[in-house]
């Protein structure tokens, strides 16, 4: 939430947003440890699957959306649920799986329709002309990856990493999420601990690029493991 994210002193002075480690699998971003990032974990098996609590769709994986697990259930308890396939019922775009969007309460293929009005403007303004603008797009509905074909360039507003061009990931920045560069060798990254330690903070970093992993920098001058920098290094 804005309250926890933006008012936290711990996150106001993070290192510059360089991009980062293999983080939250759904959004492909890495966050500084310490502040919980409740998101979908689609890499878990059914056997050990634990539902991730969420507040908004952006906190879930690419193939998930945020909602109450039971119809008419406790509105205060929301978890990441599997997205809905084509021809399934929906209430908003994020409920539909990538490649689809919600039209008249049904998930339909993005390819079958040329978007009109606000959504069409969203695509053109934010991504088609490389002019990301407030007018015409909205954070939780019209910016879903299923709704446009042109990928966002660095600095474009996004909802998920699939919204961004190659070499970029979708990462949180203040009250928004924008396409940021995937990390190169030697750049600082954030190594997550175990499940549940994904941080929700102002500067999320991307994962390390192909052939790289986020590892402790070999530095003999560092005294404690906890204070050591993690950088993207060759496997």
């Amino acid at each position: 939430t804005l309250n926890s994210v933006l008012n936290s002193n711990a996150i106001k002075n993070l290192p510059p947003p360089l991009g980062g480690a293999a983080g939250h699998p759904g959004s492909a971003v890495s966050a500084a440890p310490g502040i919980l990032y409740p998101g979908g974990n689609k890499y878990q098996t059914i056997d050990n699957y634990q539902p991730y609590p969420c507040a908004e769709d952006e906190e879930c994986g690419t193939d998930e959306y945020c909602a109450s697990p039971t119809r008419g259930g406790d509105a205060g308890v929301q978890i990441c649920l599997a997205c809905r396939k084509r021809r399934k019922r929906c209430m908003r775009h994020a409920m539909c799986c990538p490649g689809n969007y919600c039209k008249n309460g049904i998930c339909v293929s993005s390819d079958q329709n040329h978007f009109r009005g606000e959504i069409e403007e969203t695509i053109t303004e934010s991504f088609g002309n490389d002019h990301s603008t407030l007018d015409g797009y909205s954070r939780r509905t019209t910016l879903s990856s299923k709704m446009y074909h042109t990928k966002g360039q660095e600095g474009s507003v996004c909802l998920r990493s699939s919204d961004c061009a190659s070499g970029l990931c979708c990462a949180r920045h203040f009250w928004s999420k924008i396409c940021k560069p995937v990390l190169k060798e030697g750049q600082v990254c954030t190594k997550h601990r175990r499940k549940g330690s994904h941080g929700l903070e102002i500067f999320q970093r991307c994962y390390c690029g192909e052939g790289l992993s986020c590892r402790i920098q070999k530095d003999h001058h560092q005294a404690s493991n906890s204070s050591r920098l993690h950088t993207c290094q060759r496997h």
Epitope: L2, K12, N13, P16, L134, S138, L143
Partner: antibody
Framework: EVQLLQSAAEVKRPGESLRISCKTS????????MHWVRQMPGKELEWMGV????????SYNQKFKGHVTISADKSSSTAYLQWSSLKASDAAMYYC??????????WGQGTLVTVSS | DIQMTQSPSSLSASVGDRVTITCRAS??????LNWYQQKPGKAPKLLIY???RLHSGVPSRFSGSGSGTDFTFTISSLQPEDIATYFC?????????FGQGTKLEIK
């Protein structure tokens, strides 16, 4: 078209309370964060704080925290900035700005607040 | 807070001139820099975001460059309607902060 219409100019005395408004149209109010920015006469712009109208979450610049309150009314698609006790130093132009990215793309026309005894 | 310092504080140029304004951040802000134009009695207008990306509807004579701590805003060919005060803004670290402004006048 995104439009932000701010309330009229106000003339107040120190110690009085005040609430100024920013009525939005042309977009879904809960889909954008709303910011307030202060500009004192002939000075730079200062970010005061932000509200997420979808859930009421707020964040403030430490400089203004505790002195102003940012709120939003979903039913009227209106954001508010209020003071419980004005100071002479609060005299300034106040702008609301609605955005999704880390920039301020749409602005209200501004509300001039005059505080004098 | 990150301090943003603009220079010059004011400048006078002729129509058709190339105009350059600089903005220096007190610490590295990567590409997280925006530029705004404010005309007297009006609200600011976003011109450039993320250092160099032109906002929708903004003429191509406006451009931005730089990285880290030093940034430049350029008007390639000054037009009469460009008379305004220009502000830079960092959005790297909370709170977002603005430069003190550069007032541009026509000779």
């Amino acid at each position: 078209e995104v439009q932000l219409l701010q309330s009229a100019a106000e003339v107040k005395r120190p110690g009085e309370s005040l609430r100024i408004s920013c009525k939005t149209s042309g977009y879904t109010f809960t889909e954008y964060t709303m910011h307030w920015v202060r500009q004192m006469p002939g000075k730079e712009l200062e970010w005061m704080g932000v509200i997420d109208p979808s859930n009421g979450d707020t964040s403030y610049n430490q400089k203004f925290k505790g002195h102003v309150t940012i709120s939003a009314d979903k039913s009227s698609s209106t954001a508010y900035l209020q003071w419980s006790s004005l100071k002479a130093s609060d005299a300034a132009m106040y702008y609301c700005s609605s955005t999704t990215g880390p920039w301020f793309a749409s602005w209200g026309q501004g509300t001039l607040v005059t505080v004098s005894s | 807070d990150i301090q943003m310092t603009q220079s010059p504080s004011s400048l006078s140029a002729s129509v058709g001139d190339r105009v350059t304004i600089t903005c220096r951040a007190s610490q590295d802000i990567s590409n997280y820099l925006n530029w705004y134009q404010q005309k007297p009695g009006k609200a600011p207008k976003l011109l450039i975001y993320y250092k160099s990306r032109l906002h929708s509807g903004v003429p191509s004579r406006f451009s931005g460059s730089g990285s880290g701590t030093d940034f430049t805003f350029t008007i390639s060919s000054l037009q009469p309607e460009d008379i305004a005060t220009y502000f830079c803004q960092q959005v790297h670290t909370l709170p977002p902060t603005f430069g003190q402004g550069t007032k541009l006048e026509i000779k």
